[in-house]
Amino acid sequence: ATKLTEEKYELKEGQTLDVKCDYTLEKFASSQKAWQIIRDGEMPKTLACTERPSKNSHPVQVGRIILEDYHDHGLLRVRMVNLQVEDSGLYQCVIYQPPKEPHMLFDRIRLVVTKGFSGTPGSNENSTQNVYKIPPTTTKALCPLYTSPRTVTQAPPKSTADVSTPDSEINLTNVTDIIREQKLISEEDLEQKLISEEDLHHHHHH
């Protein structure tokens, strides 16, 4: 089995997590993609998903989460704005590919959000403050329900299913961009990995 790895990101309340999930292959470009949280002892829960089929460069906003799929570069951009301490947890991007199981993108993200406080060495909020303007978006976050044993997702709570932002733009201030790359385990890599493991097993017994 593929070892699941995590990357840890530490941010302060009010900041923005900005990650890029790298899905690499063209065949996944139009596939519906989702951002999930994995809580201890629970199945992965889908917080937001792109439309189906996923539209190019079309922001989908669900609460404080904004997803934007860039087909031409094979990147799904995930932003979680105005982070709160309770947002801390383990997250992952997945690609829906029914009837098959969702395809998980590696690595998972361990987000740690701490209370912000002034006087932190090296931080000057006034000089490093960024302002992001997210265009108004209305979308239906209709995420599929899966019950596969390996990666299970749930539909988001009813309250987040229909989301409409006001006509005015949302100003996202005090933003720190966390840029990361997620590697997709491609078919051939997986094939090579299995071959390597088979060889290792073979040599171990001889």
Epitope: L25, E26, A29, G74, L75, R77, I179, E181, L184
Partner: antibody, heavy 121, light 111 residues
């Protein structure tokens, strides 16, 4: 093991045509875009063009120097990419390499050994 | 089209010494802070070989004396301790926009 083997090179007169083939093996051919890159003797590398996958409707893109004269195609059932070269000029003389990227706008990790095309009268 | 200009055109470095090759793009080759800029090594009679992808990622099997850095329009390939087998021509290449383009190449020799 990923392998790319070019064929079809040779001597052709200016104004003539030639079709190069790139036979691929060792990976799921239909999943990846395929590119052609050329190199004139003693010169640098020049990207010729690329063809995307079925998911992207086999879209093609070309360098300005060959646009309108060269056509890239692929046959996923044969694991083969092609470069049809028409209205050849002496400056098209080069070694032509077939290369495969690692995904959307990704790096060229795999290259063929190249096939020589000579355009001369 | 994005023009990539490498400097110097040729470089002679003593064995064991550091070699540095620069690549400047006429416009940014970044998308979301990802630099779609790659480095290749080519020896006579051989196809190019990938060394570094997306500015700073070392390709599997490439010795760690090779490293890449930079973003936006300015990039650098560094060989920390030149070995005899590193004599070759080095190319940068961008894939951020069509048409993809290569730098003109830098010939690396031993002093």
């Amino acid at each position: 093991e990923v392998q790319l083997v070019e064929s079809g090179g040779g001597l052709v007169q200016p104004g003539g045509s030639l079709k190069l083939s790139c036979a691929a093996s060792g990976f799921t051919f239909s999943t990846y875009a395929m590119h052609w890159v050329r190199q004139a003797s003693g010169k640098g590398l020049e990207w010729v063009g690329r063809i995307r996958t079925k998911s992207s409707n086999y879209a093609t893109y070309y360098a300005a120097s060959v646009k309108g004269r060269f056509t890239i195609s692929r046959d996923d059932s044969k694991n083969t990419a092609y470069l049809q070269m028409n209205s050849l000029k002496t400056e098209d003389t080069a070694v032509y390499y077939c290369t495969r990227d690692m995904g959307i706008r990704r790096q060229f990790a795999y290259w063929g050994q190249g096939t020589l095309v000579t355009v001369s009268s | 089209d994005i023009v990539l200009t490498q400097s110097p055109d040729s470089l002679a470095v003593s064995l064991g010494e550091r070699a540095t090759i620069n690549c400047r793009a006429s416009e940014s080759v970044d998308t979301f802070d990802y630099s779609f800029l790659h480095w290749y090594q080519q020896k006579p009679g051989q196809p190019p070989k990938l060394l570094i992808y997306r500015a700073s990622n070392l390709e599997s099997g490439v010795p760690d004396r090779f490293s890449g850095s930079g973003s936006g329009t300015d990039f650098t390939l560094t060989i920390s301790s030149l070995q005899a087998e590193d004599v070759a021509v080095y190319y940068c290449q961008q894939s951020n926009e069509d048409p993809y383009t290569f730098g003109q190449g830098t010939k690396l020799e031993i002093k």
